[in-house]
Each structure stands twice: as structure tokens, then as C-alpha cells.
């Protein structure tokens, strides 16, 4: 059974992940982002179901494509800290949160999503899990 300290650690990790995803979304939605229209043409894949930490496997699998799209937006008006580091940090958190005991084959929804929809989906996921822990 999860201890209060492990629950607290999970909560902090989720909050960190949430902040990183929100930072990316804010950068993309920034009215000064000249690349928004182009960035919205890239397709991302969403999980059919995302209700447990193990479902973060579906986020992990889309981090590389996310990094590639973010690389396109590194302009003066779009300030993200080094994309590679940011995605790497997210990846570390995701790996810790989902655990490595069970390898889940992610089931994806049929419809694709824009980068904004994709980020919003995972932000909602983090908020939802955090609310169950508090």
C-alpha cells in the first residue's frame, strides 16, 4: 500500500509535470508565437483511456514528436528553456511516475489531436490524478 511519503512524492512529481506541460502550452498559445498556425498542423496521438499513472506510457511515446515540433518554435518571441532539457526532464518524471514494473501497450484513440489539444489532455490528466491524491 502507498505510504503518505510516497503519495507526497507522487503528488510533487505530478505537480512538476503539470507545470512543465503548462509552460509549454503557454509558450505555444502566446499571441507572439508566429509559428502557432504551423504548429497546429502536426498530428499527435491521444490515449483511448488515461485514468491511471501507468497510462503515462502514452505520453512518453509522444515526447519525441513533441520535441521536434517545439524545436521549430525557438524564436525570440517564444521563450522555452532548452527544448531537449525540458523534454528530458518530463521524460524522467514520466518514467518515475508510471513505473517500470508493467509495460503497458498504449491504446490510442482513432482521432488525432493538435499540439494544443494534446497538451490540454495531459494537463487535465495531471490535475485529475493530483485531485485524487489530495
Amino acid at each position: 500500500a502507498p505510504t503518505s511519503s510516497s503519495t507526497k512524492k507522487t503528488q510533487l512529481q505530478l505537480e512538476h509535470l503539470l507545470l512543465d506541460l503548462q509552460m509549454i502550452l503557454n509558450g505555444i498559445n502566446n499571441y507572439k508565437n508566429p509559428k502557432l498556425t504551423r504548429m497546429l498542423t502536426f498530428k499527435f496521438y491521444m490515449p483511448k483511456k488515461a485514468t491511471e499513472l501507468r497510462h503515462l506510457q502514452c505520453l512518453e511515446e509522444e515526447l519525441k514528436p513533441l520535441e521536434e515540433v517545439l524545436n521549430l518554435a525557438q524564436s525570440k518571441s517564444f521563450h522555452l528553456r532548452d527544448t531537449k532539457d525540458l523534454i528530458s526532464n518530463i521524460n524522467v518524471i514520466v518514467l518515475e511516475l508510471k513505473g517500470s514494473e508493467t509495460t503497458l501497450m498504449c491504446e490510442y484513440a482513432d482521432e488525432t489531436a493538435t499540439i494544443v489539444e494534446f497538451l490540454n489532455r495531459w494537463i487535465t490528466f495531471c490535475q485529475s490524478i493530483i485531485s485524487t491524491l489530495t
Epitope: F42, F44, E61, L72, S75, Y108
Partner: antibody, heavy 121, light 113 residues
Framework: QVQLVQSGAEVKKPGSSVKVSCKAS????????IHWVRQAPGQGLEWMGW????????AYAQKFQGRVTLTADTSTSTAYMELSSLRSEDTAVYYC??????????????WGQGTLVTVSS | DIVMTQSPDSLAVSLGERATINCKSS????????????LAWYQQKPGQPPKLLIY???TGQSGVPDRFSGSGSGTDFTLTISSLQAEDVAVYYC?????????FGAGTKVEIK
Amino acid sequence: QVQLVQSGAEVKKPGSSVKVSCKASGYSITDYLIHWVRQAPGQGLEWMGWIDPEDGVTAYAQKFQGRVTLTADTSTSTAYMELSSLRSEDTAVYYCARSLDYDPIYPFAYWGQGTLVTVSS
Amino acid sequence: DIVMTQSPDSLAVSLGERATINCKSSQSLLRNGNQKNYLAWYQQKPGQPPKLLIYYASTGQSGVPDRFSGSGSGTDFTLTISSLQAEDVAVYYCQQHYVTPPTFGAGTKVEIK
């Protein structure tokens, strides 16, 4: 039709810089990324980096970071690759290339004819 | 960086016979979301730039003869020339287009036996 025409061969001294041009035609240069790939004599292909001519955003291979500069002039539909601190192992054919789609990792469907840069004292 | 390993280094095949080139990547090139493998094949003839033959492991580039086909998934891929023609003499390269930096195999030289 899509065409990428590069500048002519160059002979350079070690320590100097070279600037290769790549003029795009048959499409709007701001619609796609331009990549640079080099090939040493008798060797394989090595990706150097890309530029988005629309806003000058670039990505470089770690190996060339700090030594290569990619720029573009949209008024002349020309992209440039400048490589500094040249050494003999930089002797290669340098290609500009354009992908099939506006995507940093799409494969390269269109290539320039190549520019041979020889570094020799 | 993803390492691409090609085999064999060179290959001599009789005209009209099948030529098979292998390519192995150091990590999977399969994106589960769309079930696509991000691998391309190029042909390069002496003094010419490379020419894109196949991308997404098996999608033929427009104008490429259908004797060229690609297969494989994950980390193991194959380019097949079903019936070798004289004009197919060239060096063939695989390339992953999954992540930056895109990386190439060392090439396979195809000759006529």
C-alpha cells in the same frame, strides 16, 4: 519544378571559413525547412542542421554547434551555410536539401547538386 | 543519437536477380500512435546527390520504379530490388527520420555480378 542550385567549388586554407549558397526555385522558400548534409570523399552522409527561412530558427547537429551558421535571405530565396575554423577533415561535398513536408524530420526529397569544399594548406 | 547499421557493405547481383539490403537501428523507429516506421532509403550514383526512394519504411516516393520496395518494423528494415537493372548500380543508404539528428547508415554498394 522544385530546384536547389548551389554555389561553386571552393578551396580554403585551414583555419579559414567558407560560405556556401543554395538558391531555391519552384516553391516559396519560406514554406519548408532547408537542411544541410555533407559527404566526405568516399564516405557516408552526415546531417549538419536545418534552418526555417521564414524566421531564421535553426537546429544544429551537436558536432557542428558553434562552428556552423545557417542563414537565409527570403528576398533572394537563398539559404547559406557558413563553416568556420576549417580543418582538413572538413573536405567534403556539402548539400542543401528540402524535405517533402514542413517537418524537421521528414526525409529529404529535393537536393542541391552539391558544393565541393577542399581544405588544404 | 540513433545509430544506423547497414549490411552488407557491398553486394554483387546478376541482372534481373533480386538484391536485398539490410538496415538496423539502435532504437525502435516505430511511432505507436500511427504505427509508422520512420525509416527512409536513398540511392546515390557517382557524382550525384542522393535520391529518395522510400520513406516510412515502405512508402515509395513518387516516380520511383516499383521494383524498389521497403519492409520491416521497429529496428530491422530491408530494401529489396526485385529485378536488378543496370541503372540500379549505386550506393544505397538508410536514414532514420524519427528524431533529430537524422542519421544515416554507412551505405551499401550494389554492383552487377
